[in-house]
Interface confidence: low
């Protein structure tokens, strides 16, 4: 029987700069029941606080709700693992909420074959930003990426859409069924998961009108 191994805070993510969650990996348990606690203080403060919510983020997590989240302050946190034989501490992690944002996937992905008059047809892909993101405040710039492939193909074709919430794709294989997905990331932060796939059947006459 041994003291617990050193835990590691391996990930912190925020969906929208208003709340965030951190997760840790336990070290070895030393063969004994082990308790974990996360403590933190904000840069410039000396007062230590304990994690306000160990439940919302699931096992081995700490969730910081709105009232505990400030995008203007750096959080310095560590995890303490304790059993009957002793304690061990993770390394301190410095967390700036601005840099840990991982939005939800974009919403309302709509894909349609468009045929403007006397123009080559194209795939028009349109989506909405994730609900939790408030773009009106100007705190966020969301960037988008699209991927698509014929249903049976192995390779995805990737297109960077910048800040647009719609995108045109011209070169497609007639008669094929395509999968289309979109994801987003803030200017500083992480890519969201891909949105659920939308399927679109490309007509076999996907050619110029004239």
């Amino acid at each position: 029987q041994l003291p617990p191994g050193k835990p590691e805070i391996f990930k912190c993510r925020s969906p929208n700069k208003e709340t965030f969650t951190c997760w840790w990996r336990p070290g070895t348990d030393g063969g004994l029941p082990t308790n974990y606690s996360l403590t933190y203080h904000r840069e410039g403060e000396t007062l230590m606080h304990e994690c306000p919510d160990y439940i919302t983020g699931g096992p081995n997590s700490c969730h910081f709700g709105k009232q505990y989240t400030s995008m203007w302050r750096t959080y310095i946190m560590m995890v303490n693992a304790t059993n009957q034989m002793g304690s061990s501490f993770s390394d301190e992690l410095y967390v700036d909420v601005t840099y840990i944002v991982q939005p939800d996937p974009p919403l309302e992905l709509a894909v349609e074959v468009k045929q403007p008059e006397d123009r080559k047809p194209y795939l028009w892909i349109k989506w909405s930003p994730p609900t939790l993101i408030d773009l009106k405040t100007g705190w966020f710039t969301l960037l988008y990426e699209i991927r698509l492939k014929p249903e049976k193909a192995a390779e995805w074709e990737i297109h960077f859409a910048g800040q647009q919430t719609e995108f045109k794709i011209l070169s497609l294989h007639p008669g094929q069924k395509y999968l289309v997905q979109v994801r987003c990331k803030p200017d500083h932060g992480y890519w969201s998961a891909w949105s659920p796939a939308t399927f679109i059947q490309i007509p076999s006459d996907f050619t110029m009108n004239d």
Partner: antibody
Framework: EVQLLESGGGLVQPGGSLRLSCAAS????????NHWVRQAPGKGLEWVSD????????NYADSVKGRFTISRDNSKNTLYLQMNSLRAEDTAVYYC???????????WGQGTLVTVTS | QSVLTQPPSASGTPGQRVTISCTGS?????????VHWYQQLPGTAPKLLIY???QRPSGVPDRFSGSKSGTSASLAISGLRSEDEADYYC???????????FGGGTKLTVL
């Protein structure tokens, strides 16, 4: 046989609302764009709005933007035009039309008359 | 201002050839968008007469033909008949309006 049958027209006061319907039959409604086009008494044709097959995309003439809403119910094979804040200059026969491939209007209904007057 | 300009009226005698013009701009016909022509007989709904500049739907007699050049298009009717008396409209997509434009219409009278 392709058929488009408009309904819902009538007399309405300025500022009022009407909803026009266009019942389609004789073709796979969900495979086509659809349009509303109007014709004021003794005047020419004026395009009002169009809507894509799955309702993802809509376009409007500047004269009706913000007041009219085009929609469709593919399960009912029906096209709609919700007209709000109606003005005297909206008085016209309203036609629905089917948009074939490049959206050219290949079949038209017989029209329904909307009269806006106090 | 995006407009398609047509002569308000045209006329001819039976058997004659009549041409109706449709003049647009760089945001519609001149942009490369195709032109469609519609015929509206008195008291009826419009009917597609010519599509994609010069194509005839099935059932339209070959007396009707269309052409396009630059920012203009024209509809020609040869071997004019009394039943051709109608209003004729050109239409094209307009890029700046992101919508359809109809010409003002030409009333054709068969004398």
């Amino acid at each position: 046989e392709v058929q488009l049958l408009e309904s819902g027209g009538g007399l309405v006061q300025p500022g009022g609302s009407l909803r026009l319907s266009c019942a389609a039959s004789g073709f796979t409604f969900s495979s086509y764009w659809n349009h509303w086009v109007r014709q004021a008494p003794g005047k020419g044709l004026e395009w009002v709005s169009d809507i894509s097959r799955a309702s993802s995309y809509t376009n409007y003439a500047d004269s009706v933007k913000g007041r009219f809403t085009i929609s469709r119910d593919n399960s009912k094979n029906t096209l709609y035009l919700q007209m709000n804040s109606l003005r005297a200059e909206d008085t016209a026969v309203y036609y629905c039309a089917r948009g074939l491939d490049a959206r050219r209007m290949d079949y038209w209904g017989q029209g329904t008359l909307v009269t806006v007057t106090s | 201002q995006s407009v398609l300009t047509q002569p308000p009226s045209a006329s001819g005698t039976p058997g004659q050839r009549v041409t109706i013009s449709c003049t647009g701009s760089s945001s519609n016909i001149g942009y490369g968008y195709v032109v469609h022509w519609y015929q509206q007989l008195p008291g009826t709904a419009p009917k597609l007469l010519i599509y994609r500049n010069n194509q005839r739907p099935s059932g339209v007699p070959d007396r009707f033909s269309g052409s396009k050049s630059g920012t203009s298009a024209s509809l020609a009717i040869s071997g004019l008949r009394s039943e051709d008396e109608a209003d004729y409209y050109c239409a094209a997509w307009d890029d700046s309006l992101n919508g359809w434009l109809f010409g003002g219409g030409t009333k054709l009278t068969v004398l």
